[in-house]
Every structure is written in C-alpha cells, then in structure tokens.
C-alpha cells in the first residue's frame, strides 16, 4: 500500500474541530464540460420502465434542486405499448453527498450530508414467493 | 414574503478567501437510516437490461470509492433470456458532488467537484434515423 | 457582468427551421439548469424546454416536443434551441433563463446570488409566409 | 388554456393591498415549490418570489408569497404605481414533467 505523505503547503490543521471540520473551495470544478450532450436526455420517456421526474427543492441545501424519478407503472411496457404487469418497474436508487447549512441560514457554513435519491427506473422481473 | 435574516451564530466570515472558502463538518448526517437495505440490492442482475459494478477508487476523492454501472449487452433480455437487439440497454448517469484534496494529499482541505457517474441501466426504445 | 444573450432570431416561413442561441456571461454556467421561455406577442409566458446543468435530461412542452431540441455546450457557455417544422403558433419572442431554483448565497461562490434569476432580453421568432 | 389558473386583472388604488390567486393541481402546486415573476411592459420577466415565499434581494418587502394546498397567493401592499405589470405564477408539474405557468394577471394602479 502506499501511504501519501502530506503537502507541507497544506493550510493548517491545529484547529480544535480538526479533523471533523475542514476548508472546502466551493467554486466547483465541472468534470463533465465534454460530456455527450445526448447521453441520456429523454430516456425517462423511451424506457421500458418510464418515470416523471420530481422536483426537489430546498434553499438550506446545495445542491438545491435534486431531481427524483417516480416510475410511472408498476409494471413495465411492453413491444404493444401496454403495461406488463408480470415484470417490475423499479427504482434505481444512489446515496449522494449534499451540503447542508449549518447553523441555519448561514452562508459560509456547512455539513455533509448523504442523502438517497432515485436517478430513473429499471424493468426487473419479480421475485417470486411460493406459499406452501 | 421572507428574507431569511443571517444567523448571527454564523461562524466569521471576514477569512480573505470567504465567501469562496468555506467550513465543512465532515461528521456525515445520514437520512437515509430507515430505507429498505434490500432497496436495489439485485436489480443489477435481475433488470433487462443487467449491469455489472465497476469500483472506482481515489484516494484524493471523498468519497474514495464510487460505483460506476456498466450495461452488460447493448440490447435487453426478452422473456426467453435472450438478448434482444431491437432494444437498448443504456445508462442512467447522475451528476454528483465530491471532495477533491487541495492541495493534494491535504487532510482538511478540499474542493468541491461535480462528476458524473452512471447508477444503472435502462431499457430503451431506439432512435431510428430515417435515411431519405 | 453577469448576463444571457440571445440570438438567431428572425423570420422564417412555415416549415422552415432557425437556431437560437443564448450566451452566458459572468458566471458558472455549467452549474446551472437552463430553460427556454416563450412569449406570443400580446400572450403569456410558455414554457419551451429545459435542460439540466451538464445537458444529461431535457424536457419539452407537448406543442414543440418532435420538433424542437435543446443542447448546450458548456466549454463555450452557450445554450441551444433548434426548431424544426416551424409553425405559425410557434411565433413569439424567445428568453432563455436560469433555473429559478438554482440559487445560493453568494456571486462570489461562483453561483448566482439567493433566488437571482437571469433573463435574456429575448430574441424574436416570427414565423410567415 | 394554462395549468395555473390566475385571474386576467386586478386593480387597486395607491397605498392599498392587492392579493392575486393561482391555483394549479396536486402535481404541480400541490407537490411542488411556486415562484412569482414581474414583467414590466417592454421588458423580460423577473423573479419576485421563489420557493413560495422567499424574495430575491431587492424585491421590497410588499411582496409576498404564501401556499396552501393546491393555491398559491402573491400579495401586495402599499401598492405603488410601479407596481403596474403583468405578474405570473410558475411551477414545476411533475405530470407533465415541465414547467407550468398562469395565463398572467395585468396589475393597473388606478
């Protein structure tokens, strides 16, 4: 294993909160300037399992609008158009880190969250219980 | 209507860098407590359009480890089992936020970063160009 | 200075096709969900399209979905709005806009401040034979 | 016709308070936070209130915005002659899976 050894310009640390509170640089850096712009656009219409997309929205909170999927059906569409319902709409579900404000109201401080949201829906066939 | 007043327990903001540096708690507020742990558990193979899970690791990222969904076919499985071509399998991809170390290697100080990360697969209808 | 630009209006007959544009300035524009707004002369305001901050989701209003596509392109901070099989209702005067929810504290986060929303000044789409 | 449902005018003397109405369905009003937008003749659209009741800086404390079920009231007082405008309501609509507004209310200062 590889033990990084510390940047001698890093700010300093002696803070009595260290290390449960830390500086973070919140002009964000976008990783996905060069992304496809078609990548998954409409999916939500042409899936197999379709969602609405709901808005999630809370000032104290940034990101402050996070979008939920709400699949549509509880069962899946199928090559007539019609709802299956012997197959599954499900949610596919992700945990992700949100910066709360905290105290309230306050502009410069925050706390990780992690919260879990539903990105879109996927078609999955049953379990099946047999009752004896 | 409400102009939420500034807490005055805010921590000082008069730091060179505010209101660009900010203070984080890192000590992770979970609300995700009370969910189903069998949530999506399987859905990755149980979907009809299966993927597999593919672990990023980055010492400089919290988190230091992401899952990343990778469509197992380029159609979905029909009711035969069978990959059926007709159809889709493509990813749902979900810009998140991150912890970046910056400077590098530094324990307690970090930037935001957006990424983009895929959570799952779906099963779509084609586009179909038409060629004149 | 923080603004948004259009452009690429103009008149086209029915059928025909235009492209506009909106520039953003003065801030992180890649952070940002970004929606079209229209207005008929002497009408309301009408939703057009949205897209999310990195171009993954868009949406469409049912009068303009097929023919219309929204796109952004974030390293030259420009959004889109390409409209195909352009009918007579769809003339009005186009805006583009920041999401109203997309707020937070401070211009120097590299945000827009609380609840601050950008318009453009709109650019006109007339559609005539 | 508009998802919101606003009255087409209202009117009201100096000095006075004026409540415009919308109302909209459990998919959107009902589920989702509203804004308020002012637009000047002549002018684009700007924000008044966000997330039901909040004013972006520099919008007078006249302005309010409150939500009750599917119904989201924008009230003025101390009307002011600059006040004349058309106002409208928005909010996301999860049915649709787009933004809805009101047709607008054309606010005169008699």
């Known amino acids: 294993g590889i033990t990084i050894p510390r940047n001698p310009g890093c700010p300093n640390s002696e803070d009595k909160n260290f290390p449960r509170t830390v500086m973070v640089n919140l002009n964000i850096h976008n990783r996905n300037t060069n992304t496809n712009p078609k990548r998954s656009s409409d999916y939500y219409n042409r899936s197999t399992s379709p969602w609405n997309l709901h808005r999630n929205e809370d000032p104290e909170r940034y990101p402050s609008v996070i979008w939920e999927a709400k699949c549509r059906h509880l069962g899946c569409i199928n090559a007539d158009g019609n709802v299956d319902y012997h197959m599954n709409s499900v949610p596919i579900q992700q945990e992700i880190l949100v910066l709360r404000r905290e105290p309230p109201h306050c502009p410069n401080s925050f706390r990780l969250e992690k919260i879990l949201v539903s990105v879109g829906c996927t078609c999955v066939t049953p379990i099946v219980h047999h009752v004896a | 209507g409400i102009t939420i007043p500034r807490n005055p327990g805010c921590p000082n903001s008069e730091d060179k860098n505010f209101p660009r540096t900010v203070m984080v708690n890192l000590n992770i507020h979970n609300r995700n407590t009370n969910t189903n742990p069998k949530r999506s558990s399987d859905y990755y193979n149980r979907s009809t359009s299966p993927w597999n899970l593919h672990r990023n690791e980055d010492p400089e990222r919290y988190p230091s480890v992401i899952w990343e969904a990778k469509c197992r076919h380029l159609g979905c499985i029909n009711a035969d089992g069978n990959v059926d071509y007709h159809m889709n399998s493509v990813p749902i991809q979900q810009e998140i936020l991150v912890l970046r170390r910056e400077p590098p290697h530094c324990p307690n100080s970090f930037r935001l970063e957006k990424i983009l990360v895929s959570v799952g697969c779906t099963c779509v209808t084609p586009i179909v160009h038409h060629v004149a | 200075e923080v603004q948004l630009l259009e452009s690429g209006g103009g008149l086209v007959q029915p059928g025909g096709s235009l492209r506009l544009s909106c520039a953003a300035s003065?801030?992180?524009?890649?952070?940002?969900?970004m929606l079209w707004v229209r207005q008929a002369p002497g009408k309301g305001l009408e939703w057009v399209s949205s897209?999310?901050?990195?171009?993954?989701?868009?949406m469409y209003a049912d009068s303009v979905k097929g023919r219309f596509t929204i796109s952004r392109d974030n390293s030259k901070n420009t959004l889109y709005l390409q409209m195909n099989s352009l009918r007579a209702e769809d003339t009005a005067v186009y805006y583009c806009?920041?999401?109203?929810?997309?707020?937070?504290?401070?211009?120097?986060?590299?945000?827009?401040?609380?609840?601050?929303?950008?318009w453009g000044q709109g650019t006109l789409v007339t559609v005539s034979s | 016709q508009s998802a919101l449902t606003q009255p087409p005018s209202a009117s009201g003397t100096p000095g006075q308070r004026v409540t415009i109405s919308c109302s909209g369905s459990?998919?959107?009003?009902?589920?989702?936070?509203v804004n308020w937008y002012q637009q000047l003749p002549g002018t684009a659209p700007k924000l008044l209130i966000y997330?039901?009741?909040q004013r972006p800086s520099g919008v007078p404390d006249r302005f309010s915005g409150s939500k009750s079920g599917t119904s989201a009231p924008l009230a003025i007082s101390g009307l002011q002659s600059e006040d004349e405008a058309d106002y409208y309501c928005?909010?996301?609509?999860?049915?649709?899976?787009?933004?809805?507004f009101g047709g607008g209310t054309k606010l005169t200062v008699l």
């Open positions: 459990s998919s959107n009003i009902g589920s989702n936070t």
């Open positions: 928005a909010v996301w609509d999860d049915s649709l899976n787009g933004w809805v």
């Open positions: 003065g801030f992180t524009f890649s952070l940002y969900d």
């Open positions: 897209i999310s901050s990195s171009g993954g989701v868009t």
């Open positions: 997330s039901n009741n």
């Open positions: 806009t920041t999401d109203p929810g997309n707020y937070y504290d401070s211009s120097g986060y590299g945000w827009l401040g609380p609840g601050v929303n950008l």
